[in-house]
Amino acid sequence: FERTRSLQDPCSNCPAGTFCDNNRNQICSPCPPNSFSSAGGQRTCDICRQCKGVFRTRKECSSTSNAECDCTPGFHCLGAGCSMCEQDCKQGQELTKKGCKDCCFGTFNDQKRGICRPWTNCSLDGKSVLVNGTKERDVVCGPSPADLSPGASSVTPPAPAREPGHSPQ
């Protein structure tokens, strides 16, 4: 009998949203308020994450899944599962330890987050500059100078694509 019990753990029958209550003869009890179990067979429920202060609730906690947080306006998420909120800056700025700072000449940032980056040096990739860079935009590189024959019609290029926007996956 004991061998059968050890092979067939009664706790394995407890579904997500419950826990195996040792105090009640290993009965499956529902997770108490503000707690959850996302998998079956758990002996405890995990405390729900609370989205406080600069964090706001993106998804409420349920008996089977944790709450999910994002950031209040003016801040953006960092880290796995939005573990931190970081202050936004304007495009053309970067966040330093002293706050938001304008990008220096020759650098750009087209996001509200991240660093000011040097403009791409088109010539290093054998190309020429089609559109000059600004504080908010990288240069746009085009064909190499040799590819631009005299008298070729000049076409206005499309606006540069946005830099990577690191939205949580």
Epitope: R113, G114, I115, N121, C141, A161, P164, H166
Partner: antibody, heavy 120, light 106 residues
Amino acid sequence: QMQLVQSGAEVKKPGASVKVSCKASGYNFAGYYMHWVRQAPGQGLEWMGWVNPQSGGTNYAQKFQGRVTITRDTSASTAYMELSSLRSEDTAVYYCAREGEGRGLDLDWWGQGTLVTVSS
Amino acid sequence: SYELTQPPSVSVAPGKTARITCGGNNIGSKSVHWYQQKPGQAPVLVIYYDSDRPSGIPERFSGSNSGNTATLTISRVEAGDEADYYCQVWDSSSVVFGGGTQLTVL
């Protein structure tokens, strides 16, 4: 599961070029800059440059300017690093690494590395 | 160009605290990141933005940064912590790594 899988080891002669690939999976490839870092045997880490997978914009370490070209193929979620005019001092393990989020530019995920041996 | 200076090696007994320094001019104004690299493996980010830990990195790893020195602290050191450790910063146009510190667990 996020992964950066690099191409296999290469043996090259001095003066030749090598092109190493880095295939990304498990995340939005276009959403994160990709960097290349190398490490010579018994030495430290040396940054080579980055590519913006969305626009193709690049930035190279001064030491490698004129010899390195970093490109990407967004449809294949793959970044490439080509190094030309190889010399014996270029023998190293070459890593691709994904840039993290926010300020300060950290490299939060690395490929397994590709050994490039330059020998006559 | 910006330079980061690390001690080549640090030794520590198991269970004790290891401190690895990274020196640079006014480094306290920059965000410092730390990587652990074990032999034959790729580097792994263990601390970012001076003192934040990626998920999966034990709480024993912590960081600080002020003035001209950033420090990686590993408390209750284990044999598995034996590795090379690199600090890294972004400096206006390039990514800069320290020379690396080999941590030996005695």
